[in-house]
């Protein structure tokens, strides 16, 4: 866990450092607490909205909160691209936009966010709890992916559109559990430190076993390199039950958002470099939900399959592939 998050490892003190013991004892808990709280700061956010006027129409919005330059965005559904997910659109900041059914319109909203309108009927129609994923390839951060879905109404017979709060809380129930575990872990860690207060203060030192993200400019098409790129992601719901949508959103009702920011990924830098990244707030309630998702995302239940990294805006090029980096 410590290795994945690149939390500095605890090392025995070196001779001659005892004099700083009091200072270190005061600082250490705060450093650890900061790391615990900021460990889940999101880097990629995903929002899924179903249009009330068109039951089979969805809008997916994704954004990247890193400071690097985005080189390619891939939107998929049914899971991450390359993990059984189906590509819906590929957006390149300079080369253009490619989209495939049931995607209707993909576009850049800003230099770091995109939107995709999906519609369909029959087999290609999206449904309430389909999982949508956005993968951002950026330089120098690497490849980041986040997934989200629109939670279905808990009562299929509802005649009025559901309000956002209950549905978001349904997701929060599970997330609070994960967050609780994380919080307990942090508190327990502090408790242990407090118990060992009389001992010499441990020295903070970056973990030597922390995996470093591959350089964004090196793209290798080999299976070995692909297997080395595992991107964690948060999957909400993957089963597809269109029936739950039938009466959930009558015509004329408001559309609503499920905001699912989560970070995923290869971090070449330590936590301090990304800890201050802002969370996109959409109302106080959603803002809280964002933060919880962020924390839950830090230690996901499972890891996605190998993802090919194309930091170049255009794919395997320059790194050798149908797109690459300059």
């Amino acid at each position: 866990m410590r290795t994945e998050a690149q939390v500095p490892a605890l090392q025995p003190p070196e001779p001659g450092l005892e004099g700083a013991m009091g200072h270190r004892t005061l600082v250490l808990p705060w450093v650890l607490l900061t790391l615990c709280v900021t460990a889940g700061t999101p880097e990629v956010w995903v929002q899924v909205r179903m249009e009330a006027t068109e039951l089979s129409s969805f809008t997916i919005r994704c954004g990247f909160l890193g400071s690097g330059s985005i080189s390619l965005v891939t939107v998929s559904w049914g899971g991450p691209n390359g993990a059984g997910g189906t590509t819906l659109a590929v957006l390149h900041p300079e080369r253009g936009i490619r989209q495939w059914a049931p995607a209707r319109q993909a576009r850049w909203e800003t230099q770091s966010s995109i939107s995709l309108i999906l519609e369909g009927s029959g087999a290609s129609s999206p449904c309430a709890n389909t999982t949508f994923c956005c993968k951002f390839a950026s330089f120098p951060e690497g490849s980041w992916e986040a997934c989200g879905s629109l939670p279905p109404s808990s009562d299929p017979g509802l005649s009025a559109p559901p309000t956002p709060a209950p549905i978001l809380r349904a997701d929060l129930a599970g997330i609070l559990g994960v967050s609780g575990v994380l919080l307990f872990g942090c508190v327990y860690l502090l408790h242990l430190l407090r118990r060992h207060k009389h001992r010499p203060a441990p020295r903070l030192q970056p973990s030597r076993t922390s995996p470093q993200a591959p350089r964004a400019r090196a793209w290798a098409p080999s299976q070995a390199s692909q297997a080395a790129l595992h991107v964690p992601y948060a999957t909400i719901n993957t089963s597809c039950r269109p029936a739950t949508l039938d009466t959930a959103h009558p015509h004329g009702g408001p559309s609503w958002w499920a905001s699912l920011p989560t970070h995923a990924a290869h971090r070449p830098q330590g936590p301090a470099a990304w800890a201050s990244t802002p969370i996109p707030a959409r109302g106080s309630f959603v803002s809280v939900e964002n933060g919880l998702y962020a924390q839950a995302g830090e230690r996901p239940p499972h890891t996605g399959p190998g993802l090919t990294l194309f930091p170049d805006p255009r794919g395997p090029r320059a790194m050798e592939g149908p797109l690459g980096v300059r």
Epitope: R107, T110, L323
Partner: antibody, heavy 114, light 113 residues
Framework: EVQLQQSGPELVKPGASVKISCKAS????????MNWVKQSHGKSLEWIGD????????NYNQKFKDKATLTVDKSSSTVYMELRSLTSEDSAVYYC???????WGHGTTLTVSS | DIVMTQSPSSLSVSAGEKVTMSCKSS????????????LAWYQQKPGQPPKLLIY???TRDSGVPDRFTGSGSGTDFTLTITSVQAEDLAVYYC?????????FGGGTKLEIK
Amino acid sequence: EVQLQQSGPELVKPGASVKISCKASGYTFTDYSMNWVKQSHGKSLEWIGDITPNNGSPNYNQKFKDKATLTVDKSSSTVYMELRSLTSEDSAVYYCASLFFDYWGHGTTLTVSS
Amino acid sequence: DIVMTQSPSSLSVSAGEKVTMSCKSSQSLLNSGNQKNYLAWYQQKPGQPPKLLIYGASTRDSGVPDRFTGSGSGTDFTLTITSVQAEDLAVYYCQNDHTYPYTFGGGTKLEIK
């Protein structure tokens, strides 16, 4: 190294159909779509359509919607284009090109003649 | 469909000279969201497939000599070759990378005197 290997030249009779292929290597095939482009002798380039391997849902230039059918075989990393009801107007060089047209196959020459 | 119009259709220059060719689109190729122009330039030498030179209206593809420069925005674009070399003998195409269907210009044939 990325390579797009296209099938050899074809000589077919009017009214017949032909299926040409483009085998990709050197990158993760399912990650990126493939375009097909037509170039009649001494003329410009015309985009026929594209298809993404892990979706299988093609986009077509309306002009070629009734002429071309794009398919994918993921197991062999190959994209196919079938052209039907051929006429002399279909005689051209057909290229496959990767997602953003940065890699191109060498082209397949199709000659429709009786 | 977006119509791409190139001019001149052909031109003949001596090695070392500067060459400019134009490409106009019937609709703007500027993406309002990220302020990028989705226009590409290709070079096609005799008997070969086209080769990507410029994308995003002005970004050179990897390995493309810096004598090739793309410029312009919206509907008017230009490809400039500052000092033409013998190996630049080719047809140059511009392409709408903005909207389906992706349309190409008629090409500008560059001949070396």
